[in-house]
């Protein structure tokens, strides 16, 4: 029960995280105009990964896309790449984790397969979260560097008579959304990995009958192994790792990867 809860919670947390990463990637407010020097500006600038916008006091907002690929800073391209990789990995992770959920039955998928899928999706979520955190952090570092560079030469003028105020940019809402979303995806991934340990069988899964030599009541059956593999006579042998929950009749009639040692 605890394993199912951990897995389910990990899935939900990761889902929220990935939705946040997608939202952050699409948001225009990665960097916003610093209003420290002019808190009553009539023109407000903000920029995203894909376009830059200007919101005027009149209420008019104008956005222009970055229609060049080669002309963009390498750092911005790197951030874009990290965020997209994070989204793609997260999306694949979500798809895998849906099939891995213990509460969802798909055919007669074994717990070991679900455990492997849970681990895979968990790792994907962890990497996805790390990509988002890295992308946002790289952008934030770029902003901090540019902020102090523009502060150093904030005012340039002709003999000090005419001032040209350089627009400085500070952290936008998208950065915080990205950090939180990346963190959530990472936490969700860790939870999935923890859930995987609980899903995995404790001992090696031999699909064979147990032979008890202690009592005279139990006879030696040569067809026992054949029955256990699903190829021989259909004797009602129980799976030892399953606590006797299902008979071999209910198990798939083809050999699985655990049938041969």
């Amino acid at each position: 029960m605890a394993v199912t809860a951990c897995q389910g919670l990990g899935f939900v947390v990761s889902l929220i995280g990935i939705a946040g990463i997608i939202a952050a990637t699409c948001m225009d407010q990665w960097s916003t105009q610093d209003l420290y020097n002019n808190p009553v500006t009539a023109v407000f600038n903000y920029q995203g990964l894909w376009r830059s916008c200007v919101r005027e006091s009149s209420g008019f907002t104008e956005c222009r896309g970055y229609f060049t690929l080669l002309g963009l800073p390498a750092m911005l391209q790197a951030v874009r790449a990290l965020m997209i990789v994070g989204i793609v990995l997260g999306a694949i992770g979500l798809l895998v984790s849906i099939f891995a959920l213990k509460c969802i039955r798909i055919g007669s998928m074994e717990d070991s397969a679900k455990a492997n899928m849970t681990l895979t999706s968990g790792i994907m979520f962890i990497v996805s979260g790390l990509c988002a955190i890295a992308g946002v952090s790289v952008f934030a570092n770029m902003l901090v560097t540019n902020f102090w560079m523009s502060t150093a030469n904030m005012y340039t003028g002709m003999g000090g008579m005419v001032q040209t105020v350089q627009t400085r940019y500070t952290f936008g809402a998208a950065l915080f959304v990205g950090w939180v979303a990346g963190g959530l995806t990472l936490i969700g991934g860790v939870m999935m990995c923890i859930a995987c340990r609980g899903l995995a069988p404790e001992e090696t899964n031999y699909k064979a009958v147990s032979y008890h030599a202690s009592g005279h009541s139990v006879a030696y059956k040569p067809g026992g192994f054949k029955a256990s593999t699903g190829f021989g006579s259909n004797t009602k042998n129980k799976k030892i790792y399953d606590g006797g929950a299902r008979t071999e009749d209910e198990v798939q009639s083809y050999p699985s990867k655990h049938d041969y040692v």
């Epitope: 009539a42 009149s58 209420g59």
Partner: antibody, heavy 120, light 112 residues
Framework: EVMLVESGGGLVKPGGSLKLSCVAS????????MSWVRQTPEKRLEWVAT????????YYVDSVKGRFTISRDKAKNTLYLQMSSLRSEDTALYYC?????????????WGQGTSVTVSS | DIVMTQSPSSLSVSAGEKVTMSCKSS????????????LAWYQQKPGQPPKLLIY???TRESGVPDRFTGSGSGTDFTLTISSVQAEDLAVYYC?????????FGAGTKLEL
């Protein structure tokens, strides 16, 4: 047709109060940023206050801060300028103006103005 | 505050003449975000409210004759009337639309 009609001006003693009104018609009043601009007897134009549609932010020229309040009644399509602690330098013709949505914050429509005289 | 300085304060012209008036701002009105200049020109005739002629330093407002041309960028701006008509006799004001307070120039009076 866009129309802005100001009213409420008059003669007032220094330290007194006055409330100017501007009734708007011919456009979606709530979607536009509105301003008050005054013209002094020397014919100088001075921006007084702005009520922006962006977050409902209000802006004032330093000389009227704390004394004047700009507000609007969307239901009545009316812009107001509440003036208190009036001084002689507040004597002017007060215009109500609309900031155009695609005019780079420029005021595309103006009212005919209402005269305010502050004198003892 | 951004100070707007207009010159000359008055200008005597003859009909058909080309007129140029200047407006200088103490700070750049060019926004780096969209590379647009936030400067407007207004025309005010006696007994009338100001009328918007030019916004964004060079864009003519609809209905404004094409003899009116705005130019300039950053801190230096110009309003040119290619061929002055009798109805153009008025006071012309430039205005900073970039930063609050939205300051106006003192005006340039165009007279015959």
């Amino acid at each position: 047709e866009v129309m802005l009609v100001e009213s409420g001006g008059g003669l007032v003693k220094p330290g007194g109060s006055l409330k100017l009104s501007c009734v708007a018609s011919g456009f979606t009043f709530s979607s536009y940023t509105m301003s008050w601009v005054r013209q002094t007897p020397e014919k100088r134009l001075e921006w007084v206050a702005t009520l922006s549609v962006v977050g409902g932010n209000t802006y004032y020229v330093d000389s009227v801060k704390g004394r004047f309040t700009i507000s609007r009644d969307k239901a009545k399509n009316t812009l107001y300028l509440q003036m208190s602690s009036l001084r002689s330098e507040d004597t002017a013709l007060y215009y109500c103006a609309r900031l155009g949505q695609t005019q780079r914050n420029a005021m595309d429509y103006w009212g005919q103005g209402t005269s305010v005289t502050v004198s003892s | 505050d951004i100070v707007m300085t207009q010159s000359p304060s008055s200008l005597s012209v003859s009909a058909g003449e080309k007129v140029t008036m200047s407006c200088k701002s103490s700070q750049s009105l060019l926004n780096s975000g969209n590379q647009k200049n936030y400067l407007a020109w207004y025309q005010q005739k006696p007994g009338q409210p100001p009328k918007l002629l030019i916004y964004g330093a060079s864009t003519r407002e609809s209905g404004v004759p094409d003899r009116f041309t705005g130019s300039g960028s950053g801190t230096d701006f110009t309003l040119t009337i290619s061929s002055v008509q009798a109805e153009d006799l008025a006071v012309y004001y430039c205005q900073n639309d970039y930063s609050y307070p939205l300051t106006f120039g003192a005006g340039t009076k165009l007279e015959l």
